[in-house]
């Protein structure tokens, strides 16, 4: 209109998809009368009546707006409900009384875009790559309006850089109106961008302010030539025979190259190369001395066919060879010397002991075991053991046994045994001497004999209990080419008189055993009586 | 429109050299990456090779040594190229593109069958 | 390597139905998993992406969900069209596929 004042900035109203609109309607009275306005939308220069207000009373015009206009505020104020992104655009209310005027009111939409989504390489990329590679990629969905993308390497914001850095972004309309921001980060990536993490952040706007929001962290495969490679040796530290041992090549490539592992003959000088097992690793299972020696690695890059050896690596397997003793079978009479001296090879210091095999005493530390005034007692097992005291279980040993020349010797004189008539008793004797005896018996029975060691003897006999044999009683006879000797049981009935309350009753075998190391012990199934120690 | 479409020999002997050719319409080679994917019959999909948008070339380690993939862009073409073939390398060859702003596949070639036999 | 793993092998439904399709991934891949339809003497064709977002043109009675290593694709209401092989697809870590679900009418 001629002469009319410039048209002052649209009222800006601002408003989530969704919500409710309200749009304040602000003539004031001196400009028009509120009870009689008419609402147009204006999209692309073209006014549409969406609503008129006749006195105070709303009425809404057919089309897109129908369903979602109402009254509030004694009419002054038009609410749009179920705001959309389409609804982006410029509302006026015109009065139609004094005269026409017009108030415009801009609404602006807006929409959080969904948390963003980040998807790295999954092939890796190589970081002699001829131009910037593609590294990740990342979505925000549904947002409104359009969300810029930042990306972030290590915590710092990346910036378009030629030929180093390119970010390509677009973004689509979904039928709804909002947009899905897609977004490649492109970059040449260096060894050192192995562990850097990478992720993007979507900035967008709402009625409340700035926001953002962002992705997880990822990290990015890089792939790097290998530059150096070496050995690993598990476990760490002095190895010993026995030991699982396991030697792999690593390199400081990705991807590793392919690795072989040779051991050098310590004849030819060559180096061979030894068979790994699936994952490349050398297993030594059970380690043997042979297994020492020089180790190296090779690895081989088959894109450049480049070859890389590492330094070779000594591997020394430590060992104790078999233990050797002199006299191997010792025989002396009583009363006289005997010197046991004991050897053996190792890859490390050895430290030597004696120890008595029946009772685990150390006898001497040290390789020489000197046993003078030979009783018979010290006839029996001696046991050198010959150890790496730097090297916890690596140890050999070698068991010895000294022969004492002498006639039987019983492990006891006599013996009471408490009997039931017409039982299976069960009974034992025991004796030693050099050379080792042999054992007989004065009655008729089962009897079995076992070698117990090279001096001693046990004999056992089963034999029904009968009215003669309590009369008689039970002998046992030892006898080798120096003497014989005899032990006695004598058999006693069981009756409540000698029962004592606290005794087993339980039925079953008599047993009646004894051993020059042990207290001598008669022993029943039905009552167990100490017996005083009888040696022969 | 996006197309993809394979050729190749069809049959090959044993011990020979495979040599497939995608070539695509619709899309440049500079803006998407394409990949190989193959099919025994009645078996599942195994991914072979793949080259990138930029030219970076990248292989299934278990074929890695008998694989070479490369492209002529002016030709719009992607060649792959695998040697000593054996009867389990039997299968339906597919060329996929991959989609400008993800890594799975948004449009996929007929497919070409190659037979390896004697 | 990461392994994909699809259930059921074979899965027989009429049409109208609504099924499920399963696939399990050997370790977490977050949300690097599409899903694709195969039919007779054809190319696969993509159908999800980034284990729920749909790709342009496919029906929207095509849906996917999950995360991290299990991952489903529904479909609500079969059509006679959807009898077909389904599978999925890791791209987390390298490609590798699940050895597929056959889809047979009843």
């Known amino acids: 209109v001629p002469g009319e004042a410039e048209q002052p900035a649209p009222e800006l109203v601002e408003v989530e998809v969704g919500s409710t609109a309200l749009l304040k309607c602000g003539l004031s009275q001196s400009q028009g009368n509120l009870s009689h306005v008419d609402w147009f939308s204006v999209h692309k220069e073209k006014r549409t009546l969406i609503f008129r207000v006749r006195q105070g009373q709303g009425q809404s015009e057919p089309g897109e707006y129908e369903q979602r206009l109402s009254l509030q505020d004694r009419g002054a104020t038009l609410a749009l409900t179920q705001v959309t992104p389409q609804d982006e655009r410029i509302f006026l209310c015109q009065g139609k009384r004094p005269r026409s005027q017009e108030y415009r009111i801009q609404l602006r939409v807006y929409k959080a875009p969904e948390e963003p989504n980040i998807q790295v390489n999954p092939l890796g990329i190589p970081v002699n790559s001829k131009e910037p590679e593609e590294v990740a990629t990342c979505v925000g969905r549904n947002g409104y309006p359009i969300p810029q993308v930042i990306w972030y390497k290590n915590g710092r914001p990346l910036k378009e850089e030629k030929n180093r850095v390119h970010i390509q972004s677009s973004q689509t309309v979904e039928s709804s109106g909002l947009y899905t921001l897609q977004s490649i980060l492109k970059a040449q990536l260096v060894k050192e961008d192995k562990d850097a993490q990478f992720y993007c952040e979507l900035n967008y706007r709402l009625p409340s302010g700035n926001h953002m929001k962002e992705s997880r962290e990822v990290t990015v495969p890089v792939f790097y030539p290998t530059e150096k490679v070496w050995l690993e040796v598990e476990p760490v530290g002095m190895l010993k025979e026995g030991d699982r041992v396991e030697i792999r090549c690593l390199a400081d490539g990705n991807p590793p190259p392919h690795f072989s592992i040779s051991k050098q003959n310590p004849s030819t000088r060559e180096a061979e190369e030894e068979t790994t097992n699936d994952n490349g690793v050398l297993v030594l299972e059970p380690a043997r001395k042979e297994h020492s020696g020089r180790y190296e690695c090779q690895g081989l890059d088959l894109d450049t066919m480049i070859s890389l050896l590492s330094e070779p690596q000594e591997l020394l397997v430590n060992y104790v060879s078999d233990v050797r003793v002199s006299p191997a079978a010792p025989e002396r009479q009583e009363g006289s010397s005997l010197t046991l001296t004991c050897e053996a090879e190792s890859s490390q210091d050895l430290e030597f002991q004696w120890l008595r095999e029946e009772t685990g005493q150390v006898l001497e530390r040290g390789p020489v075991l000197q046993l003078h005034d030979l009783k018979r007692e010290a006839g029996g097992g001696y046991r050198c053991v010959a150890s790496v005291p730097s090297i916890p279980g690596l140890n050999r040993t070698q068991l010895v046994n000294v022969a004492i020349f002498g006639p039987p010797w019983m492990a006891f004189k006599e013996r009471k045994v408490w009997v039931k008539e017409n039982m299976v008793l069960n009974l034992s004797c025991e004796a030693s001497g050099h050379p080792r005896p042999t054992i007989s018996w004065n009655v008729n029975g089962t009897a079995s004999e076992q070698d117990q060691d090279p001096q001693r003897v046990l004999s056992t006999l089963n034999v029904l209990v009968t009215p003669e044999l309590l009369e008689t009683g039970v002998e046992c006879t030892a006898s080798n080419d120096l003497g014989k000797n005899t032990s006695i049981l004598f058999l006693e009935l069981v009756n409540l008189t000698t029962l004592t309350p606290d005794s087993n009753t339980t039925t079953g075998l008599s047993t009646s055993t004894a051993s020059p190391h042990t207290r001598a012990n008669s022993t029943s199934t039905e009552r167990k009586l100490p017996e005083p120690e009888s040696r022969g | 429109q996006v197309q993809l479409k394979e050729s190749g020999p069809g049959l090959v002997q044993p011990s020979q050299t495979l040599s497939l050719t995608c070539t695509v319409s619709g899309f440049s080679l500079t803006s998407n990456g394409v990949s190989w994917v193959r099919q025994p019959p009645g078996k599942g999909l195994e991914w072979i090779a793949a080259?990138?948008?930029?030219?970076?070339?990248y292989y299934n380690s278990a074929f890695k040594s008998r694989l070479s993939i490369s492209r002529n862009t002016s030709k719009s073409q992607v060649l792959l190229k695998m040697n000593s073939l054996q009867t389990e390398d039997t299968a339906m060859y597919f060329c996929a593109r991959r989609y400008g702003y993800g890594w799975y596949f948004d449009f996929w070639g007929p497919g070409t069958m190659v037979t390896v036999s004697s | 390597d990461i392994q994909v793993t699809q259930s059921p092998s074979l899965l027989s439904a009429s049409v109208g139905d609504r099924v499920t399709l399963n696939c399990k991934a050997s370790q977490n891949i977050y949300n690097s998993l599409a899903w694709y339809q195969q039919k007779l003497g054809e190319g696969p064709k993509v159908l999800i992406f980034?284990?729920?977002s749909l790709q342009t043109g496919i029906p929207s009675r095509f849906s996917g969900s999950g995360s991290g290593t299990d991952f489903t694709l529904t479909i609500s209401s079969l059509q006679p069209e959807d009898f077909a092989t389904y599978f999925c697809?890791?791209?987390?870590?390298?490609?590798?596929f699940g050895a597929g679900t056959k889809l047979e009418l009843k």
């Open positions: 080259i990138s948008s930029g030219g970076t070339t």
């Open positions: 980034n284990a729920n």
């Open positions: 697809q890791q791209f987390y870590s390298g490609y590798t």
